[in-house]
Interface confidence: medium
């Protein structure tokens, strides 16, 4: 190989050992039969050399540094050449370094040709191995602006007082152009300006200077974003730290087109703006740090650019001004993430404060909009507390558990609407009366409606789930002893059409001791399947539940148990079942931990089924499934 550097070129070439490898044989640079492991070539020198091994790329790297002095004379602006040409260099991993020194008053602009640059952070690397490292200067201190790959959005970087640019090319890469040019600009009065151009949908992750170390004290850095007019941009902070400020405040400032309050100033911990149309600037401003305990300011953020959906141009009003103790959350539904670019899905308050989820609270009217490629990616969860504090007052009150119609007007699906019903302990109980009789969801007869009511205890220490109930069954009411949560859960978008079928009324009633009482009026056409609360986990210890089963005058009810035995094993106490005829009060008692369950039996009149649990041994829980069928009476037995 021969490398000749012109005298006025200001280029030095250094060939040196790269990262040591565990290769058995060493390799040397051979110059006039002399073996060495380092070769430095200065301007005006011409050197012939070879390598002592077949694969020098495994041993050596080459650095080509060009010093450009803009202090003493004119600056060579324009497209930057790779000198010496890569074809004249040995096939080693190459790093071209351009070190430009300029006055503080002169701005220097690096312009990158397409495919532009993409910044990457610690622990990442470029797929093709081509890397740009860009640094600036503040007085004598070097500041890392960032490390970049190809195929991104960064089109220009403006700095002042000097630039150090390093282009790393792997030995196998055929590239023979630098891919950037340098231009002079007027002073930018800040550390740097990075321009990021979006041609279409996409995202860019960018970082403050020196990231992940601290941003220089009291400095200002700006990012300029060029966004096609038909697209929308949203900013989200992925990672940030604040330093300890003695004077001034660390902040970000936005120049947003059409905003009447430019610049819009945000704290780093604020929700950042979204749904922005057109170009905008974002600036990071540091502060004067505490000398004793400076801390570090750093920021990594993402700009997401995407098409606005039809929905994002609409404002939706959610009127919770008359609601109390209510919160409505719009959030992403859980999905497996694909690896390709997924446009963001944001919900925006007052069109500007956009985030992946949003909670609206009661007592106000809220205006929201959406910035989302597909609104099925979001769902809504609502929680409402209805508490009674004065048992004398509540005892005559009923409340309608209905989903407010405003919620149906939103373009996202309702997932859960939960009412937490709270009563004074040992003073009142609750009764739920549905607008349409309910069916209990069982494996044998699953619900196939677009929604169900999930009824569970709301007492923290109690693990009691009464079950899932949907309209179209035989359960007329559910009485519960104490605090419960009732959750309307939707399973299909058709819930909007079926919404008229929803409707429960809760009333506060005198206190009773049983955990739950189900009032059932079987339908003559079908089996009514009923099962004990906490199915699969077992009825909680010492819990008692009852079913009040009505039998019409002209019908006979057949009560059938699913199993021959319950399988419960009592550690303490007894588990028993009482079946009582309501008319005669005649009752039969079955020991559930000893006796077999009764064979199918016929009831000509309304009857009670009461199940009371013991304290079961672990793994030997009490679960009971039974069903009731009606058949017409053939003989009048009244």
């Amino acid at each position: 190989f021969e490398i000749a550097l012109p005298r006025e070129s200001n280029i030095t070439v250094l060939i040196k050992l790269g990262t040591p490898t565990l290769l058995a044989k060493p390799c040397y640079i051979v110059i006039s039969k002399r073996h060495t492991t380092m070769l430095s070539i200065k301007p005006g020198e011409r050197i012939l050399f070879t390598f002592s091994c077949q694969s020098p790329e495994n041993h050596f790297v080459i650095e080509i540094q060009k010093n450009i002095d803009c202090m003493s004379g004119p600056c060579p602006f324009g497209e930057v050449q790779l000198q010496p040409s890569t074809s004249l260099l040995p096939t080693l991993n190459r790093t071209f370094i351009w070190d430009v020194k300029a006055h503080k008053s002169i701005g220097l602009e690096l312009q990158f040709s397409i495919p532009r640059l993409r910044q990457f952070g610690p622990g990442e690397s470029c797929p093709d191995g081509v890397t740009y490292s860009i640094s600036g200067r503040i007085d004598a201190t070097v500041v890392r602006i960032g490390t970049f790959c190809s195929n991104g959005t960064v089109s220009r970087i403006k700095m002042q007082e000097g630039v150090k640019m390093a282009l790393h090319l792997p030995w196998f890469h055929p590239r023979n152009v630098s891919g950037f040019s340098i231009a002079n600009r007027s002073s930018i009065k800040r550390l740097c300006i990075i321009e990021s151009v979006f041609e279409g949908e996409g995202s860019a992750t960018l970082m403050s200077a020196n990231y992940p170390e601290g941003f220089p004290e009291d400095e200002l850095m700006t990012w300029q974003f060029v966004i096609p007019a038909h697209l929308r941009a949203s900013v989200s902070f992925l990672n940030f730290n604040l330093s300890n400020c003695e004077r001034k405040e660390e902040r970000v400032e936005y120049y947003i087109p059409g905003s009447t309050t430019n610049p819009e100033v945000f704290k780093l911990e604020d929700k950042q703006p979204g749904n922005m149309a057109g170009n905008f600037n974002l600036s990071l401003q540091g502060c004067d740090q505490d000398a004793q305990n400076p801390g570090i300011l750093r920021l990594q953020f993402q700009v997401l650019v995407q098409h606005p959906q039809n929905e994002s141009n609409k404002i939706y009003v959610v009127d919770l001004s008359n609601e109390r103790a209510t919160s409505l959350t719009i959030e992403p539904r859980p999905v497996k993430q694909s690896r390709k670019f997924v446009p963001g899905c944001f919900v925006c308050l007052e069109s500007r404060t956009c985030s992946t989820n949003l909670t609206l609270t009661s007592g106000s009217k809220h205006k929201i909009s959406f910035l989302c490629d597909n609104l099925t990616r979001l769902w809504m969860n609502v929680e409402k507390n209805i508490s009674c504090t004065d048992h004398r007052y509540c005892q005559r009150k009923s409340y309608s558990l209905q989903v407010p119609s405003d919620i149906f007007h939103l373009p996202v699906e309702l997932h859960d609407f939960s009412w937490k019903l709270l009563v004074p302990k040992d003073r009142l109980s609750l009764v739920l009366v549905p607008a349409q009789k309910l069916q209990q969801h069982t494996h044998e007869k699953p619900c196939n409606t677009s929604f169900s009511y999930l009824v569970a205890s709301a007492i923290p220490s109690q693990d009691l789930y009464f079950g899932s109930f949907c309209p179209g069954g035989s359960i007329e009411q559910i009485q519960v002893k104490q605090n419960i949560s009732v959750t309307l859960r939707t399973f299909a978008p058709s819930f909007r059409q079926e919404a008229s079928r929803q409707g429960l009324t809760v009333s506060f009633i005198p206190y009773f001791k049983e955990e739950g009482v189900f009032t059932v009026t079987p339908d003559t056409k079908s089996k009514v399947y009923l099962r004990t609360p906490n199915w699969d986990r077992g009825l909680p210890s010492l819990t008692s539940v009852s079913w009040n089963i009505s039998v019409p005058r002209d019908q006979v009810a057949c009560l059938t148990f699913f199993k021959e035995r319950t399988g419960v094993v009592c550690q303490t106490g007894r588990a028993f079942m009482i079946i009582q005829e309501q008319r005669t009060r005649a009752e039969e008692i079955f020991s559930l931990d000893e006796d077999a369950l009764p064979k199918p039996r016929f009831h000509h009149h309304s009857f009670w089924v009461n199940i009371s649990n013991c304290s079961p041994a672990s793994g030997k829980q009490l679960d009971l499934l039974f069903w009731v069928t009606l058949t017409p009476r053939t003989v009048d037995l009244t």
Epitope: E323, G363, K365, Y393, S400
Partner: antibody
Framework: QEQLVESGGGVVQPGRSLRLSCVTS????????MHWVRQAPGKGLEWVAV????????YYADTVKGRFTISRDNSKNTLYLQMNSLRAEDTGVYYC???????????????????WGQGTTITVSS | DILMTQSPSSLSASVGDRVTITCRAS??????LAWYQQKPGKVPKLLIY???TLQSGVPSRFSGSGSGTDFTLTISSLQPEDVATYFC?????????FGPGTKLEIK
């Protein structure tokens, strides 16, 4: 027995002022929002004003805004309506009414009005 | 402001008839609607709140339904004592406007 008794009505000339009172009993007055509603002779009901249980929020119908002031004295269990710059169209029966749910137990701020007074008549005429 | 309209403005029905009165809000009010009954010469009485919940002491022949903008008050079997004017009222937020009323008479 929950009771509301209005007083202070009478005949008054246009432009003059009048103050209505509503004395309550049989319930914890300080826990309830209170309303004034009026009814012109032979006409429907017109909501006039509401005051929250603690007096912090007050809202008025557009027809009386700036002229009428609703207030309450929880220590006296009494609701007031101060009416200034009276007009002929203010003539009617004025009812005080209790908000349908107390401030603590309710899942909503307003419920409708579940207890009404017998009303007091105002005639604005020259 | 939200406007409340009622229809019909008056109606005449026979004892035992099923009677329906409708109330419409010019904008959605969720289920924040109350129905009142005012008998001649008497004070108004709350019948139904939150669109469908019966006030305690009100006969079960009265029922309410609807949500959003359209609401109905139904008397399943008209009784002589039901002669009155019926008003709807929205209370999602102030002003708490009443409907103009529906006068119900017995044929």
């Amino acid at each position: 027995q929950e009771q509301l008794v209005e007083s202070g009505g009478g005949v008054v000339q246009p432009g003059r002022s009048l103050r209505l009172s509503c004395v309550t009993s049989g319930f914890t007055f300080s826990s309830y929002g209170m309303h004034w509603v009026r009814q012109a002779p032979g006409k429907g009901l017109e909501w006039v004003a509401v005051i929250w249980y603690d007096g912090t929020n007050k809202y008025y119908a557009d027809t009386v805004k700036g002229r009428f002031t609703i207030s309450r004295d929880n220590s006296k269990n009494t609701l007031y309506l101060q009416m200034n710059s009276l007009r002929a169209e203010d003539t009617g029966v004025y009812y005080c009414a209790r908000e349908g749910c107390d401030t603590i137990s309710c899942p909503y701020y307003y419920y409708g009005m579940d207890v009404w007074g017998q009303g007091t008549t105002i005639t604005v005429s020259s | 402001d939200i406007l409340m309209t009622q229809s019909p403005s008056s109606l005449s029905a026979s004892v035992g008839d099923r009677v329906t009165i409708t109330c419409r809000a010019s904008q959605g009010i969720n289920y924040y609607l109350a129905w009142y009954q005012q008998k001649p010469g008497k004070v108004p009485k709350l019948l139904i709140y939150t669109a469908s919940t019966l006030q305690s002491g009100v006969p079960s022949r009265f029922s309410g339904s609807g949500s959003g903008t359209d609401f109905t008050l139904t008397i399943s079997s008209l009784q002589p004592e039901d002669v009155a004017t019926y008003f709807c009222q929205k209370y999602n937020s102030a002003p708490f406007t009443f409907g103009p009323g529906t006068k119900l008479e017995i044929k």
